[in-house]
């Protein structure tokens, strides 16, 4: 006899990285017929929602109107059908960004390289942080962590055309409080030098929509929501 229901999906819209004082919605998708959803924050009950009518709703939303460092952290949700509770969802790491300062990102040996060359990103921030994060924009989640007093090195090693794309970095004051994003750095990796028609890259976004792109799981984009790549989430832990 089944003791628990399947775990729900949890994600953040528009993004798990939320600029301070901006709004974010935490979504929890369980099953039709669920009479109650609970959102837990850092292990404690944070909010409850009882959908009406339950048989026509399989998703609830918890709205945070004003993001701040106190709201940043790990969220999970569960739901109940009758007396039976679900397994808890995966953890969602909600990060507040645009805290304090802006790092600078540079790429060595330059923004245009040949496939096979060793590439290193440098992220620098002259304020009190020792953890840095490098993110590549696009469909797949690419989050790297680096450490250093005022700067971190992110060696990509010998690159391929798969490394092409737009990168940004953040200084991290703790796991869930990040700086403003750096200015973007676009890396162009040429494979066959004589033929510069290259494979299409992950979609990239203009600077002003940086906060809206989605990092997704191996399962790809879902119709009505994005699932967070567990690997990327683990990097935050």
């Amino acid at each position: 006899q089944q003791q628990t229901l399947p775990k729900p999906f949890i994600w953040a819209e528009p993004h798990f990285m939320v600029p301070k004082e901006k709004q974010v919605t935490i979504c929890c998708q369980g099953n039709y017929g669920a009479v109650e959803y609970q959102l837990h924050f850092e292990g404690s009950l944070f909010a409850v929602d009882r959908p009406k009518p339950p048989e026509r709703i399989n998703k609830v939303q918890f709205y945070i109107p004003d993001m701040n460092s106190r709201m940043a952290g790990q969220y999970s949700c569960i739901y109940r059908v009758g007396e039976l509770w679900s397994e808890p969802s995966n953890l969602l790491d909600l990060v507040v960004t645009e805290m304090y300062d802006t790092p600078t990102l540079s790429v060595h040996p330059g923004p245009e390289v040949i496939s096979g060359e060793k590439v290193t990103f440098y992220c620098r921030l002259d304020t009190a942080t020792s953890m840095f994060l490098l993110l590549k924009e696009g469909r797949s989640s690419h989050v790297q962590r680096g450490y250093g007093k005022v700067q971190a090195e992110f060696p990509l090693g010998p690159v391929t055309t798969a490394h092409r794309g737009t990168y940004r970095c953040f200084g991290s004051y703790n796991n869930h409080a990040w700086s403003f994003p750096s200015e973007p750095v676009k890396l162009l990796v040429t494979g066959d030098i004589e033929n510069t028609s290259l494979a299409p890259e992950d979609p990239t976004f203009p600077a002003d929509t940086w906060g809206t792109y989605l990092l997704t799981t191996e399962t790809g984009l879902q119709k009505d929501h994005a699932l967070w790549d567990h690997t990327a989430q683990n990097l935050l832990r």
Epitope: S106, G110, R124, Q151, E183
Partner: antibody
Framework: QVQLQQPGAELVKPGASVKLSCKAS?????SYWMHWVKLRPGQGFEW???????????NYNEKFKRKATLTVDKSSSTAYMQLSSLTSEDSAVYYC??????????WGQGTSVTVSA | DIVMTQSQKFMSTSVGDRVSVTCKAS??????VAWYQQKPGQSPKALIY???FRYSGVPDRFTGSGSGTDFTLTISNVQSEDLAEYFC?????????FGSGTKLEIK
């Protein structure tokens, strides 16, 4: 077009310091590493180091770590190299050069440094 | 440090000839080698990058070849304006190092 402007010559006394300049134009100054190279007659080129203007990160040839200091002024798109405790061994032509695409593809005209009492 | 050896300091050739300038690295540098031309009183000019790729505007009589430790710059159908010194450079590892140069003289 890309230009790296360097003064033609500097005459300095032994033991003194000199600050060489390289004014860049025609490209995004902050995005590309500025390299400095030394050329002594009959001795070939020696790579001194590089600096990225966006955040001032530097990489030096160990041999020049105590001799050369690389800096930039983003507001004027100018790179500098200060050479200290000069001796006759430092008499050379010093070039600034950038890697825009794949190798050191743009060079300044070079500054000839003469160390003489 | 990686030593880039250009064993021939001078090479003499005639207009229309073919000449090969060689460069040997003291350890494997893959294909991360560039060639430069320096004419008297001028700054160096990049000719070849990544061992064999010509910069745009460089005449196709200049070709580069090699990998690992042995590299060659070949100038076919030498012209009088090719009178210059030619340098190799490795950018595979720090510190970047240059060959000592080969002076091409036109007979």
């Amino acid at each position: 077009q890309v230009q790296l402007q360097q003064p033609g010559a500097e005459l300095v006394k032994p033991g003194a310091s000199v600050k060489l300049s390289c004014k860049a134009s025609g490209y995004t100054f902050t995005s590309y590493w500025m390299h400095w190279v030394k050329l002594r007659p009959g001795q070939g080129f020696e790579w001194i180091g590089e600096i990225i203007p966006s955040n001032g990160v530097t990489n030096y040839n160990e041999k020049f770590k105590r001799k050369a200091t690389l800096t930039v002024d983003k507001s004027s798109s100018t790179a500098y190299m200060q050479l200290s405790s000069l001796t006759s061994e430092d008499s050379a032509v010093y070039y600034c050069t950038i890697r825009l695409r794949y190798a050191l593809d743009y060079w300044g005209q070079g500054t000839s440094v003469t160390v003489s009492a | 440090d990686i030593v880039m050896t250009q064993s021939q300091k001078f090479m003499s050739t005639s207009v229309g000839d073919r000449v090969s300038v060689t460069c040997k690295a003291s350890q494997n540098v893959g294909t991360n080698v560039a060639w430069y031309q320096q004419k008297p009183g001028q700054s160096p000019k990049a000719l070849i990058y990544s061992t064999s790729f010509r910069y745009s505007g460089v005449p196709d009589r200049f070709t580069g070849s090699g990998s690992g430790t042995d590299f060659t710059l070949t100038i076919s159908n030498v012209q009088s304006e090719d009178l210059a010194e030619y340098f190799c450079q490795q950018y595979n590892s720090y510190p970047f190092t240059f060959g000592s140069g080969t002076k091409l003289e036109i007979k």
